[in-house]
C-alpha cells in the first residue's frame, strides 16, 4: 500500500495547527486542529494526550474519559455537562480540556 504525499495512513492522525496563549498567569490556553484518517466506526479524538482515532460512540455519548485522553498515571474526570474532561496528575495539578 502506497500513500500519496500528505495522505495519512488509516487509523492515524496529525496536528494541523497548534495555537498557544500564555498571557494569563499560571494558565496556558492551547487550541489545536487535527487531521485524522480513521477506520469505519471511528472518529478523531484524544488518547494519551495525543490526537487519535477513537470509537465514534464515545464522542456521541460524550464519555470523554473512555478515549483514555490522559497520560498513564493521571486521573480522568468528566466536566459538568460533559463539556470536556480534566486530567489530574499524581501531584494534584489539573489540566482541563473543553470540547468545542
Amino acid at each position: 500500500q502506497f500513500l500519496k504525499e500528505g495522505q495519512l495512513a488509516a487509523g492515524t492522525c496529525e496536528i494541523v495547527t497548534l495555537d498557544r496563549d500564555s498571557s494569563q498567569p499560571r494558565r496556558t490556553i492551547a487550541r489545536q486542529t487535527v487531521k485524522c484518517s480513521c477506520f469505519p466506526g471511528q472518529i478523531a479524538g484524544t488518547t494519551r494526550a495525543r490526537p487519535a482515532c477513537v470509537d465514534a460512540r464515545i464522542i456521541k455519548t460524550k464519555q470523554w474519559c473512555d478515549m483514555l485522553p490522559c497520560l498513564e498515571g493521571e486521573g480522568c474526570d468528566l466536566l459538568i455537562n460533559r463539556s470536556g474532561w480534566t486530567c489530574t496528575q499524581p501531584g494534584g495539578r489539573i489540566k482541563t480540556t473543553t470540547v468545542s
Partner: antibody, heavy 120, light 107 residues
Framework: QVQLQESGPGLVKPSETLSLTCTVS????????WSWIRQPPGKGLEWIGY???????NYNPSLKSRVTISVDTSKNQFSLNLKSVTAVDTAVYYC??????????????WGQGTTVTVSS | DIQMTQSPSSLSASVGDRITISCRAS??????LNWYQQTPGKAPRLLIY???TLQSGVPSRFSGGGSGTDFSLTITSLQPEDFATYYC?????????FGQGTKLDIK
C-alpha cells in the same frame, strides 16, 4: 507491575451462566480498556469483548446475545457473564489489558487463564 | 468481520534457523496488526504491535512487517524458547479477530 488474576467456577452446567472475575493489581483499572478472550481445547484464540472505564462495552457479535462484561472500579475488577452455556463454551478464559500504543490497541498484559468446563 | 488467515498452519525448523510466518487480512487494516506468542499451558504474550513495533522486553531477533492486507513475522536465529504457537490479530475493527495460529516446532 500490573498483574491480572481470573477467578470463578471451573465447572458450569449446560444452560446455566458462566461467571468469571478478573482482579487487577498494581495499577488503576480506569486508565485502560479491559478484555476477555477464550481458547477452546486445542484451538485458537477468540475475542469475547472489552469494556471501557465508563462501563461501555464492545462485544463479539457471535456472542453478543449471551455475554455481559461489567466493571467495578472500587474493587479494581471486571467481570464476564456468559449465559445459556453449552459444551462449545468449554475453554480457557483469559482476561487482558488493552493498551493504546499510540494508534495501535494491543493486549499487553494477560491473566494466566482459567479453565471452564461445561458439563452436567 | 475481518478474516485473518495465517500461513503456514504449522512449521518445523531447527535452532539457529530463520523463519517467516505470514498473515493476510480479508480487507485493508493499514498497520493495525499485532503478533502474539503462546507456549503450551501459558497465556499469550504480546510480541509486536502496529505491524512492526517490538513490545518492550521482546528480543530483537523478532521483527514484523507489512501494511494493508499482507503481514509477516520473522524470527532470525531461532532459540529453543521460540518453539511455540504464533497468532496475528487485527485491531482495526469490531470484533477483534485472530488468525488461526501457526505452530512452530523443532525439526
Amino acid at each position: 507491575q500490573v498483574q491480572l488474576q481470573e477467578s470463578g467456577p471451573g465447572l458450569v452446567k449446560p444452560s446455566e451462566t458462566l461467571s468469571l472475575t478478573c482482579t487487577v493489581s498494581g495499577g488503576s483499572i480506569s486508565s485502560y480498556y479491559w478484555s476477555w478472550i477464550r481458547q477452546p481445547p486445542g484451538k485458537g484464540l477468540e475475542w469475547i469483548g472489552y469494556i471501557y472505564p465508563s462501563g461501555s462495552t464492545n462485544y463479539n457479535p457471535s456472542l453478543k446475545s449471551r455475554v455481559t462484561i461489567s466493571v467495578d472500579t472500587s474493587k479494581n475488577q471486571f467481570s464476564l457473564n456468559l449465559k445459556s452455556v453449552t459444551a462449545v463454551d468449554t475453554a480457557v478464559y483469559y482476561c487482558a489489558r488493552v493498551n493504546p500504543f499510540g494508534y495501535y490497541y494491543a493486549m499487553d498484559v494477560w491473566g494466566q487463564g482459567t479453565t471452564v468446563t461445561v458439563s452436567s | 468481520d475481518i478474516q485473518m488467515t495465517q500461513s503456514p498452519s504449522s512449521l518445523s525448523a531447527s535452532v539457529g534457523d530463520r523463519i517467516t510466518i505470514s498473515c493476510r487480512a480479508s480487507q485493508s487494516i493499514s498497520t493495525s496488526l499485532n503478533w502474539y506468542q503462546q507456549t503450551p499451558g501459558k497465556a499469550p504474550r504480546l510480541l509486536i504491535y502496529g505491524a512492526s513495533t517490538l513490545q518492550s522486553g521482546v528480543p530483537s531477533r523478532f521483527s514484523g512487517g507489512g501494511s494493508g492486507t499482507d503481514f509477516s513475522l520473522t524470527i532470525t536465529s531461532l532459540q529453543p524458547e521460540d518453539f511455540a504457537t504464533y497468532y496475528c490479530q487485527e485491531s482495526a475493527s469490531i470484533p477483534r479477530t485472530f488468525g488461526q495460529g501457526t505452530k512452530l516446532d523443532i525439526k
